[in-house]
């Protein structure tokens, strides 16, 4: 017998869709091969109309797609738009059509409900509005209207014109008569809930006289939309629950067991500490709609969520919903890096940022996560040389080692540089990633002086000591600017006498600038490296002053300036926030706004990551 | 307080008929899957029928071993579950439960894809 299991029988409606599950040992082979989907012939033979390889047959053109999900071990067929020339025998199945291992699947597409014996069908989803229309004659104009609900053999009277609402409707019914040119008069239901369905009449007038009229109310459940991520990348939630809830409570819920559903995020300020720092709720728009990303997805965030709409901010018997069924793929794309680093008080981290490496020439930017209200990522830093003002000197992000991962170092390092920050691009929005730096005690490997002065036409010499630890790395002098740090000559002066208990591969390497002028004032790093990738890093800033004694300058530890906690602030920024996430490359919107420089600051938080793979900030 | 109550077991002979219906109380909302399976004595309690309902579509699944014999059927917004068995056979004597869950997801031949059980019922085939 076939290994393949699924639905024996599949019953719908014209018009509706279905969602096909097959289920499939989950061995490496079957995970891989070929799924598809196809009609049995009179004559026997299985026509395909859709497989994992990409063949759609023009018959499911526009409404039809197959999903795989290799960890699960199952594939779904959905299929939209169904007519009643849909029914028939299909096999869902795995490798080669005539190969057996598949299983059968009758499909059977019925009419769909229309105006059976004067009968109005009215199809809502839950959460949502109706209105029952009830015409009525003249005769009837001034009597009372009512509408009722079939209870059993009883119709429960639900609304009327004299002002009654039945208690299951309190606060989420009216009645409205038209004007006296219309011989209608309509119910309104809001808030539908699962157990408003059913059986209605409406009446105008009580006696043997009164018009009445039947309707069907079906509220359905939403159908989740079936959603397939990798591990460790990201996802957009987009929640579009109509204008009519637009100043209403949003919120974001997973369902943890049967009807429970757990907020993950919501407007009123709640978050899942799971989520913290590596979500973000986007701002409503006019229409009410609003999204949520969730990045450094874990395989625990799988399972299904809800989107809605209520007073409380958390799912409540009514609340409209939208409904996603989240699974994440283990054999991921992105590649594992760092979700913590740590570094030292006045230290540095080097922080690998992957990307999709098709996207190369994509721009890479870096955004510390901040916690309050939405959660927002104002950008500090990017590709194209822009750096925020408050971050000058001290942070630059390199295309090294390219290939699939950019680097960010951040030196200078205080207790409030610990938080969350995300590395992202404005190409494949999937390939966000989150990393947690984290300040401990301990102190800097590479030891500069503090702030430096050089003198206009003299030369200045600045030393940096690197512990034997860093004998086999690469050390180098730089110059800070927007665009990265350009490599500058130095000098291998012999071993440091700066450590205690270093031997002989310690070393000093200084920098020698020669007849310093105006444009040799700035930001100096020195740091490691092995190959391209990057290590610990210490600043120097560099003033320069008119001359006033002549000689040169050869600056050691002892003289050094104490070096700031941390330069002014700047109000220059640029972010991605509850209200400006504009850039839809970034953030999956499709609005646009390239460039977003606003005149804004924001605070600081931390949160949670992904795993607990760590990277110390001065090594690899 | 959630219940499910199975009715219609009983003693038949082999080649015989039975129905066997499943009354859900209390659940909050309609389920959305609901199915029976079978524990025979000393066995393991194995997958016997499913049915989903997902918006306005109904999907049935069946274990091999009772295909073309057992029908099964529901009506998601009453929350019943029925089970039309065929062509009684001796191996199929067991205590048959019936499942629900709100949810829709998870293999329906599994356990663990539903979370309310009820107390099940005895039915007994005779050569």
């Known amino acids: 017998k076939s290994p393949i299991f699924g639905p024996e029988e599949v019953n719908s409606v014209e018009g509706n869709s279905v969602s096909i599950t097959c289920y499939y040992p989950p061995t490496s082979v079957n995970r891989h091969t070929r799924k598809y989907w196809c009609r049995q012939g009179a004559r026997g033979g299985c026509i395909t109309l859709i497989s994992s390889e990409g063949y759609v047959s023009s018959k499911y053109a526009g409404r039809a797609n197959l999903t795989n999900f290799p960890e699960n071990g199952t594939f779904v067929v959905n299929i939209a738009q169904l007519s009643q020339d849909d029914s028939g025998r299909y096999k869902c199945g795995l490798g080669i059509n005539s190969r057996g291992l598949s299983f059968d699947v009758s499909l059977e597409v019925s009419q769909g409900p229309g105006l059976l014996n004067d009968t109005k069908v009215y199809t809502v989803d839950l959460g949502r509005t109706v209105t029952i229309n009830c015409p009525f004659k003249t005769e009837n104009a001034q009597k009372r209207k009512s509408l009722y609900k079939q209870i059993g053999l009883y119709p429960v009277l639900v609304i009327d014109s004299s002002g009654y609402v039945n208690p299951n409707y309190t606060g989420r019914i009216r009645l409205d008569i038209q004007g006296t040119g219309q011989l209608l008069f309509s119910v309104v239901i809001n808030q539908l809930r699962l157990s408003d369905a059913g059986q209605y009449l409406c009446q105008a007038g009580d006696d043997s006289n009164s018009n009445k009229k039947n309707a069907d109310l079906q509220v359905l459940k939403p159908e989740p939309e079936l959603v397939y991520e990798d591990l460790r990348g990201s996802v957009t939630f987009h929640c579009a629950l109509g204008p009519e809830v637009a100043n209403v409570a949003k919120f974001l819920c997973r369902q943890s067991s049967g009807e429970n559903c757990d907020v993950v995020v919501n407007t009123l300020g709640k978050r899942a500490p799971a989520f913290e720092g590596r979500i973000l709720l986007n701002p409503q728009d006019k229409d009410g709609s609003f999204s949520v990303v969730i990045t450094g997805l874990r395989k625990e965030d799988a399972g299904r969520y809800l989107c809605g709409a209520h007073s409380d901010g958390q799912l409540q018997e009514g609340s409209p919903i939208q409904a996603w069924q989240l699974f994440v793929n283990e054999e991921s794309t992105i590649p594992r890096s760092p979700t913590v680093v740590k570094g030292v008080a006045g230290g540095s981290v080097a922080v690998l940022c992957p990307y999709n490496r098709k996207e190369s020439k994509s721009i890479k930017y870096w955004c510390l996560w901040e916690g309050a209200q939405n959660g927002r990522c104002p950008l500090l830093v990017d590709s194209e040389g822009w750096v925020k003002a408050q971050y000058e000197g001290r942070l630059s992000l390199l295309e090294e080692p390219g290939n699939g991962t950019f680097t960010v170092i951040l030196n200078q390092l205080t207790s409030r540089d610990a938080g969350f920050y995300w590395c992202l691009t404005n190409g494949d929005t999937l390939w966000r990633t989150t990393v947690e730096i984290k300040i401990i005690e301990g102190e800097p490997n590479l030891k500069v002086p503090g702030n430096v002065t050089a003198v206009l036409g003299e030369t200045l010499k600045v030393p940096c000591h690197f512990p034997c630890k860093f004998s086999s790395y690469e050390k180098y002098w730089c110059k800070w600017n927007n665009t990265g740090c350009q490599a500058l000559p130095s000098q291998d002066e012999g071993p440091s006498k700066a450590f205690v208990n270093c031997d002989e591969n310690s070393r000093l390497v200084s920098l020698t600038l020669n007849l310093v002028t105006r444009a040799d004032e700035g930001w100096y790093w020195c740091g490691v490296k092995q190959g391209h990738f990057y290590g610990e890093t210490a600043a120097v800033y560099v003033a320069v002053e008119e001359r006033k004694a002549a000689g040169s300058r050869d600056v050691s530890l002892a003289k050094a300036d104490a070096a700031p906690d941390e330069k002014v602030l700047d109000s220059g920024f640029r972010e991605i926030e509850n209200k400006a996430i504009q850039d839809p490359r970034l953030f999956a919107e499709e609005k646009a706004v390239a460039d977003t420089r606003d005149q804004a600051d924001g605070s600081r938080a931390s949160v949670d990551s992904g795993s607990s793979e760590e990277q110390g900030g001065s090594s690899r | 307080e959630v219940q499910l109550v199975e009715s219609g077991g009983g003693v038949v002979q082999a080649e015989d008929s039975l129905r066997l219906s499943c009354a859900a109380s209390g659940l909050p909302f309609s389920s959305s899957r609901m199915g029976w399976f079978r524990q025979a004595p000393g066995k393991e309690r194995e997958f016997v029928a499913a049915?989903?309902?997902?918006?306005?579509?109904?999907?049935?699944y069946y274990a091999d071993s009772v295909k073309g014999r057992f029908t099964v059927s529901g009506d998601n917004a009453k929350k019943t579950l029925d089970l039309q068995m065929k062509d009684l056979k001796p191996e199929d004597t067991a205590v048959y439960y019936c499942a629900a869950h709100p949810d829709y997801y998870g293999d329906p031949r599994t356990s663990g894809a539903y979370r309310y059980w009820g107390q099940g019922t005895q039915v007994t085939v005779s050569s």
């Open positions: 049915i989903g309902w997902s918006g306005r579509s109904t999907y049935k």
